[in-house]
């Protein structure tokens, strides 16, 4: 009788283990589904936020701090006060960002549009020559590709011309101690799906 009871107990344990195994598999499957859905939601939220942002040039769903411009995967701020290259570097760091880095043609078009000035104000970029006469490097250490733009060596600068500024779509090497405006950039955060909540009464407006 004891053996039978023990055997029945074993059966019950096996069944429970099997059920537990199935539940564990179901849980894993649900977790995978949840991750996929979260990814899809994130993708849709970013797409919708971009459309809303594109329309107005600003939106509360923007992953950029207020007043910062969202372009591509980054947030940008073009400041009006002038500083040396090094002061711009530290200023951007204090803003939890780095100096402007131009990776591709569209970034250059964007930077040219944002920095264009009838008063010929120029802006420091994060491009420099750590050793005079050697290779141009971005602040993060990546090398500059000359296909992107031509650096005009400014012969009017009296000292070494190892820092690079953008002036009305043209790129000049300048003395790093010259005072120019700062441009800071930082990686855009994630779009928060909840920031896309639109009050029902505003739906359909402006379309």
């Amino acid at each position: 009788q004891y053996y039978q009871l023990s055997n029945t107990g074993q059966d019950t344990i096996s069944q429970m283990e099997e059920r537990l195994g199935n539940t564990s598999q179901e849980l894993q499957s649900l977790q995978v589904q949840n991750i996929k859905l979260a990814g899809s939601l994130q993708h849709v939220a970013e797409k919708l936020c971009r459309e809303l942002y594109n329309k107005a040039g600003a939106h509360r769903c923007s992953p950029c701090t207020e007043q910062w411009k969202w372009h591509g995967d980054n947030c940008y701020q073009f400041y009006k006060d002038s500083k040396s290259w090094e002061d711009c570097k530290y200023f951007c760091l204090s803003e939890n960002s780095t100096m402007l880095k131009i990776n591709k043609q569209e970034d250059l078009e964007f930077a040219a549009s944002q920095s264009y000035s009838e008063f010929f104000y120029s802006y420091w970029t994060g491009l420099l020559r750590p050793d005079s006469g050697k290779a141009w490097l971005w602040m993060d250490g990546t090398p500059f590709t000359s296909e992107l733009f031509h650096i005009i060596i400014d012969v009017t600068s009296p000292r070494s011309r190892d820092c690079v500024a953008i002036l009305n779509g043209m790129i000049f090497s300048k003395d790093c101690k010259e005072l120019k405006r700062c441009v800071c950039e930082r990686r855009a955060g994630m779009v928060k799906p909840e920031s896309l909540h639109v009050p029902p009464e505003t739906l359909g407006e402006g379309d």
């Epitope: 594109n54 040219a112 549009s113 264009y116 779509g169 043209m170």
Partner: antibody, heavy 117, light 107 residues
Framework: QIHLVQSGPELKKPGETVKISCKAS????????MNWVKQAPGKGLKWMGW????????TYADDFKGRFAFSLETSASTAYLQINNLKNEDTATYFC??????????WGQGTLVTVSA | DIQMTQSPASLSASVGETVTITCRAT??????LAWYQQKQGKSPQFLVY???TLAEGMPSRFSGSGSGTQFSLKINILQPEDFGTYYC?????????FGAGTKLELK
């Protein structure tokens, strides 16, 4: 997908006014300037100037100062070119083109303005 | 203002040939030069900027070269869709100016 869609052709009399629109989509309108380019029939391209979409400040090439006006309706992602007191020599196709005054990656399809008595 | 001079004004060629169009600036524009192609009744299409950098999606048979005041656009092994008018344009400050164009026709 980035698009610049311009308004349709216009037939005007000398002395009248025309206003052409250029509606942008697929990008943040205020992130890039907007330029205007003229092409007279059978002729080449002539840059008229541009408008800063952040500030609304227009800049005109010397030949286009006076009767020409660039404007914006930012909320509609639209740039406008208005030509006042039309003359026969204003007969041309007018293009909008995205960007700072540099090279132009994206162009509108063009708007033909015909000025004839 | 910087003037841009293109040559030749027109050019006849056959499919499969290689052609070169030249452009001269009245002053040093470094590498600040763009090229466009325009078909009849269409808007210009962006080909090259920075004298030699090919626009995204443009076939590699197009190549730009030059700096300073002398520039050229070379089209290797012409395709039927390459016929049209080509314009150079400096982007070294304003006012921007275009060359008068080179009409590339089918021989």
């Amino acid at each position: 997908q980035i698009h610049l869609v311009q308004s349709g052709p216009e037939l005007k009399k000398p002395g009248e006014t025309v206003k052409i629109s250029c509606k942008a989509s697929g990008y943040t309108f205020t992130n890039f300037g907007m330029n205007w380019v003229k092409q007279a029939p059978g002729k080449g391209l002539k840059w008229m100037g541009w408008i800063n979409t952040n500030t609304g400040e227009p800049t005109y090439a010397d030949d286009f100062k006076g009767r020409f006006a660039f404007s914006l309706e930012t909320s509609a992602s639209t740039a406008y070119l208005q030509i006042n007191n039309l003359k026969n020599e204003d007969t041309a196709t007018y293009f909008c083109a995205r960007g700072a005054p540099a090279w132009f990656t994206y162009w509108g399809q063009g708007t033909l303005v015909t000025v004839s008595a | 203002d910087i003037q841009m001079t293109q040559s030749p004004a027109s050019l006849s060629a056959s499919v499969g040939e290689t052609v070169t169009i030249t452009c001269r600036a009245t002053e040093n524009i470094y590498s600040y030069l763009a090229w466009y192609q325009q078909k009849q009744g269409k808007s210009p299409q962006f080909l090259v900027y920075n004298a030699k950098t090919l626009a995204e999606g443009m076939p590699s048979r197009f190549s730009g070269s030059g700096s300073g005041t002398q520039f050229s656009l070379k089209i290797n092994i012409l395709q039927p869709e390459d016929f049209g008018t080509y314009y150079c344009q400096h982007h070294f400050g304003t006012p921007l100016t275009f060359g008068a164009g080179t009409k590339l026709e089918l021989k």
